[in-house]
């Protein structure tokens, strides 16, 4: 929901967390603000305190339950409000009717590990974290490999258009240090976006055998 120079953006991690960012030009720094979640078909509601992340933006996480609980479904609609304290009362600064499964951002993949490494290739696996079973296999991944002397931004993106929690990296240089990252996105949801990148996994290819061409 955008209100003048105010922007209120939230994502559901598909299980028990809604993360929100609210930005507003000229907002008072000392004001206490919170996000309030009111589902249309649940008996519970939840709030979180907005904390500053930059000069004009605040963020918070609505914890809806245990991390792997399925607290919302495709039919839920959650009214999300930004409330800021004005004296003794709360003022509504932004509001949106939030459809959780139209606004998905999963947790970053975890448990990255090298399954097998050779001189020119490396097989890497990972796991998805706190992802709803609703997706079944309807997920896609992007991966990138950091080569020596390059930046992450320069790394070409490898796309996996299916739920495949491994990759075999080819054409690597022997005896070279690399880093690898992966992110995940459900196919569902009009405003769904990529998860954060995973923590980088460092690995080194094996040296070429002596006396052999590389």
């Amino acid at each position: 929901a955008v209100n003048g120079t105010s922007q209120f953006t939230c994502f559901y991690n598909s299980r028990a967390n809604i993360s929100c960012v609210w930005s507003q030009d000229g907002a008072l720094q000392d004001t206490s603000c919170q996000v309030h979640a009111w589902p249309d078909r649940r008996r519970w509601n939840q709030t979180c305190e907005l904390l500053p992340v930059s000069q004009a933006s605040w963020a918070c996480n609505l914890i809806l339950g245990a991390p792997d609980s399925q607290k919302l479904t495709t039919v839920d609609i959650v009214t999300l409000r930004v409330l800021c304290r004005e004296g003794v009362r709360w003022r509504v600064m932004a509001i949106q009717d939030f459809k959780p499964f139209e606004n998905l951002r999963l947790m970053a993949p975890i448990s990255l590990q090298v399954v097998h490494v050779e001189t020119h290739r490396c097989n890497i696996s990972w796991e998805i974290s706190q992802a709803s079973h609703y997706f079944e296999r309807h997920l896609e991944f992007e991966a990138r490999t950091l080569s020596p002397g390059h930046t992450w931004e320069e790394a070409p993106l490898l796309t996996l258009k299916q739920k495949q929690e491994w990759i075999c990296l080819e054409t690597l240089t022997p005896d070279t240090q690399y880093e690898f990252q992966v992110r995940v996105k459900p196919l569902q949801g009009e405003f769904t976006t990529w998860s954060p990148w995973s923590q980088p996994l460092a690995f080194r290819t094996k040296p070429a055998a002596l006396g052999k061409d590389t």
Epitope: W44, A66, S69, Q70, K71, L72, T73, D76
Partner: nanobody, 116 residues
Framework: QVQLQESGGGLVQAGGSLRLSCVAS????????MAWYRQGADNQRVLVAA???????AYGDSVKGRFTISRQNARNTVYLQMNSLKPEDTAVYYC??????????WGQGTQVTVSS
């Protein structure tokens, strides 16, 4: 359907402790997460603590470090150990269970009153 029955509420002085219990019956195999919510004078039902079938937990900010949630899957029971109770913890405490499909089940609630 899942039925939930809470017990353990009561009147306690500030600084004291209480242990709430909740027993699930019925279609217990469908239960994933179990949780405690509380509803105070503002009539809002908010999360106190939650625990998944495999033991992952989450707590409301106001109770972190004071309350501990635990679960015995074999007994279909969830507990809430409440220490260092404050008057602002006074509320009706509700047991909640959520299914793998996202359905919510609720107990009838148990009153906790903390006097100063």
């Amino acid at each position: 359907q899942v039925q939930l029955q809470e017990s353990g509420g009561g009147l306690v002085q500030a600084g004291g402790s209480l242990r709430l219990s909740c027993v699930a019956s019925g279609s217990v195999s469908s239960i994933n997460g179990m949780a405690w919510y509380r509803q105070g004078a503002d009539n809002q039902r908010v999360l106190v603590a939650a625990i998944s079938r495999v033991g992952n937990t989450a707590y409301g900010d106001s109770v972190k470090g004071r309350f501990t949630i635990s679960r015995q899957n074999a007994r279909n029971t969830v507990y809430l150990q409440m220490n260092s109770l404050k008057p602002e913890d006074t509320a009706v405490y509700y047991c909640n269970a959520d299914s793998w499909g996202g359905d919510d089940y609720w107990g009838q609630g148990t009153q906790v009153t903390v006097s100063s």
